[in-house]
């Protein structure tokens, strides 16, 4: 995991200032409002059923 200002996060992940680490963009499906999702190229919103099954 990279600190801000050094090497970028690996492919498919994005830096979270809130958590102070790189996070998987895949998790933006379930948690689209996470701070790091802004840095993910494509973060589709979670299906309704996942958030409220």
């Amino acid at each position: 995991e990279q600190a801000p200002g050094t090497a970028p996060c690996s492919r498919g992940s994005s830096w979270s200032a809130d958590l102070d680490k790189c996070m998987d963009c895949a998790s933006c499906r379930a948690r689209p409002h996470s701070d790091f999702c802004q840095g993910c190229a494509a973060a589709p919103p979670a299906p309704f059923r996942l958030l409220w099954p």
Partner: antibody
Framework: QVELVESGGGLVQPGGSLRLSCAAS????????MSWVRQAPGKGLEWVAE??????????HYAESVKGRFTISRDDSKNSLYLQMNSLRAEDTAVYYC??????????WGQGTLVTVSS | DIQMTQSPSSLSASVGDRVTITCRAS??????????MHWYQQKPGKAPKLLIK???NLESGVPSRFSGSGSGTDFTLTISSLQPEDFATYYC?????????FGGGTKVEIK
Amino acid sequence: QVELVESGGGLVQPGGSLRLSCAASGFTFSSYWMSWVRQAPGKGLEWVAEIRLKSDNYATHYAESVKGRFTISRDDSKNSLYLQMNSLRAEDTAVYYCTGYYADAMDYWGQGTLVTVSS
Amino acid sequence: DIQMTQSPSSLSASVGDRVTITCRASQSVSTSSYSYMHWYQQKPGKAPKLLIKYASNLESGVPSRFSGSGSGTDFTLTISSLQPEDFATYYCQHSWEIPYTFGGGTKVEIK
């Protein structure tokens, strides 16, 4: 380092109740979804219940096998997770694991606490 | 509910062997970008440990001999060269929807 420590397991009679606790440290507890996963003796893993965040109004979800009998809760001020188990049955006998995850994959696991339901 | 079928349920292998474990979901657990399938390792008397998330992302600290692949309904966990510490039971799990379900497990034993 991350640590999840379960407690509260033990022997209980069918129809009885038990409350499990999980003390968390080493990560931002209030930002993580939490679940209980159980494992019956010699068997595989079964997801039991999940609780999300304050921003989700602490939304909870349950496996059909425990719905109406078990209640998951959390206290972010104490970095603690709970599982209230009522109307216990023999088939609830298992090791119960506390798990933490930001979403999807269960990154953090406790060591487990054994619940035995028997007369 | 999504059913997860793991195979084989057990296997015997020697140190240095290449081992492949498969997991099939009863419906797709993938989007066009990501697969919501994860793999865990469990040793006797211990808690499960996350190895791979999102089908192919190796968890930090997990040896590179472990790899994951697949999309849609069919997924594979591969150990390229089995080591003594790898003898354990392996589980797949989806997070596509509630309820989350696990595969039945694959026990890797010493031949």
